[in-house]
Amino acid sequence: EPPTACREKQYLINSQCCSLCQPGQKLVSDCTEFTETECLPCGESEFLDTWNRETHCHQHKYCDPNLGLRVQQKGTSETDTICTCEEGWHCTSEACESCVLHRSCSPGFGVKQIATGVSDTICEPCPVGFFSNVSSAFEKCHPWTSCETKDLVVQQAGTNKTDVVCGPQDRLR
C-alpha cells in the first residue's frame, strides 16, 4: 500500500495535512493554511492514549467497589485506569468490568492453579495416590499417607477424597 497524502502523525482535512494531537490532548480546532492544529490537555479523570483528532477525551474507567473492583493502576491523561478485583475475587472478562468469587475445588479435586485478580481457580481431579477431602480455593491434592514409612500397613484404601487409613501390622503369635 503506497503512503497516503499526509505523513504519520498527520491527518488530511480540507485539502491540507494537519498535525494530530499527541496522547493526552484533544483537538480544539483543525489547522488552516495559516494556523497550526490547536490541541488542549485532557481534564482530570480523562485520557486519550493515541495520536488523535478526537474532540472529546475518554473518561477514565471507574472501578466500582460494589462490583468487587478496585484500582490496580491509576489512569493518567494518556492511559486509562486499570481495575482489578478484591482479594478472593477475579474479573469476569478481559476488560474487568465486574468480579466473581474465586471457585473452590470440590473434594476429589485439587487446585492446579491458584486464582488471580484476572483468572479463576483451575482445579484438577486428584490422581491415584492423591486426595482432597475439602472444598478449597487453595488446597492442592495431597499424597496418600505412606503407611510403610511409618512401619504401618494399609487398613483402609485411600480414594480421591480420603486418605488411606494405616494400622499396626498383625503380630505373629
Epitope: P2, T4, A5, I13, N14, S15, Q16, T32, E33
Partner: antibody, heavy 116, light 107 residues
Framework: QVQLVQSGAEVKKPGSSVKVSCKAS????????IEWVRQAPGQGLEWIGV????????NYNEKFKGRATLTADKSTSTAYMELSSLRSEDTAVYFC?????????WGQGTLVTVSS | EIVMTQSPATLSVSPGERATLSCRAS??????LNWYQQKPGQAVRLLIS???RLHSGIPARFSGSGSGTEYTLTISSLQSEDFAVYFC?????????FGQGTKVEIK
C-alpha cells in the same frame, strides 16, 4: 502570484491512456497538496485524488483506484495525472488545484476527449 | 460518500439584489465547507473556505454561514461579474465531494 498551468487538450482512443501535466509556480511546490478533479460536459465536479508533492503520498477516489496514477516531479514543480483504460465516459475537462483550506488555486483545465 | 445537494439549481436575480444559495450535506461536515465560482473560459475560483473564511482577493459582498449539514452562500448585492455557476464542496471526509452547482443568472 500562484499559477497552475496545465498541458493542452488531448484526443484519445478508448483503451488508451492520457497523462495531464500541471506546472506550479509562485509558491513552494512541496508545501501544499495538489488535488485533481474532473468535469464531464454539462456536469458537476468529481474528485479524482490528491498527492503530496513533498514525498509522493497519495489518496485516490475509490472510483479511480487502479486507473488513475498521480505523480509529482519536485525538480520541475510539476504534478501529473495519468488515467488508463480510457472509455467514452472519461471525456471531461481535467483540473489540478492547489490545496490549503480548500482548493485554493485552480489550473485552467485540460479537455480530454475519448473517441474512436 | 457524503452527498452534497445544492438548491436551487438556477437562481434568477436582478443586479444589486441579494442572492442566497444553499448547500446541504448528507452528514455533519464540521464546517469544512468551501464555495467556488465557475465562469466559462476562466479558471475556477475559491470564494470561501471552512464555511465563512473569505479567500484572498474575494470581495466582501460574498459571505458564508452554516453548521452541521446546512450551509449558505450569500452575495449581498449582485454585480454583473457575479453571474456564474457556484459549487459547494465538503473537505471533511474522503472522497471530497461537490454539489451539482447553482447557476446564478440575470433576471
Amino acid at each position: 502570484q500562484v499559477q497552475l498551468v496545465q498541458s493542452g487538450a488531448e484526443v484519445k482512443k478508448p483503451g488508451s491512456s492520457v497523462k495531464v501535466s500541471c506546472k506550479a509556480s509562485g509558491y513552494g511546490f512541496t508545501n501544499y497538496l495538489i488535488e485533481w478533479v474532473r468535469q464531464a460536459p454539462g456536469q458537476g465536479l468529481e474528485w479524482i485524488g490528491v498527492i503530496n508533492p513533498g514525498y509522493g503520498g497519495v489518496n485516490y477516489n475509490e472510483k479511480f483506484k487502479g486507473r488513475a496514477t498521480l505523480t509529482a516531479d519536485k525538480s520541475t514543480s510539476t504534478a501529473y495525472m495519468e488515467l488508463s483504460s480510457l472509455r467514452s465516459e472519461d471525456t471531461a475537462v481535467y483540473f489540478c488545484a492547489r490545496g490549503g483550506s480548500g482548493f485554493a488555486f485552480w489550473g485552467q483545465g485540460t479537455l480530454v476527449t475519448v473517441s474512436s | 460518500e457524503i452527498v452534497m445537494t445544492q438548491s436551487p439549481a438556477t437562481l434568477s436575480v436582478s443586479p444589486g439584489e441579494r442572492a442566497t444559495l444553499s448547500c446541504r450535506a448528507s452528514q455533519d461536515i464540521s464546517n469544512h465547507l468551501n464555495w467556488y465560482q465557475q465562469k466559462p473560459g476562466q479558471a475556477v475560483r475559491l470564494l470561501i473556505s471552512s464555511t465563512s473564511r473569505l479567500h484572498s482577493g474575494i470581495p466582501a459582498r460574498f459571505s458564508g454561514s452554516g453548521s452541521g449539514t446546512e450551509y449558505t452562500l450569500t452575495i449581498s448585492s449582485l454585480q454583473s461579474e457575479d453571474f456564474a455557476v457556484y459549487f459547494c464542496q465538503q473537505g471533511n471526509t474522503l472522497p471530497w465531494t461537490f454539489g451539482q452547482g447553482t447557476k446564478v443568472e440575470i433576471k
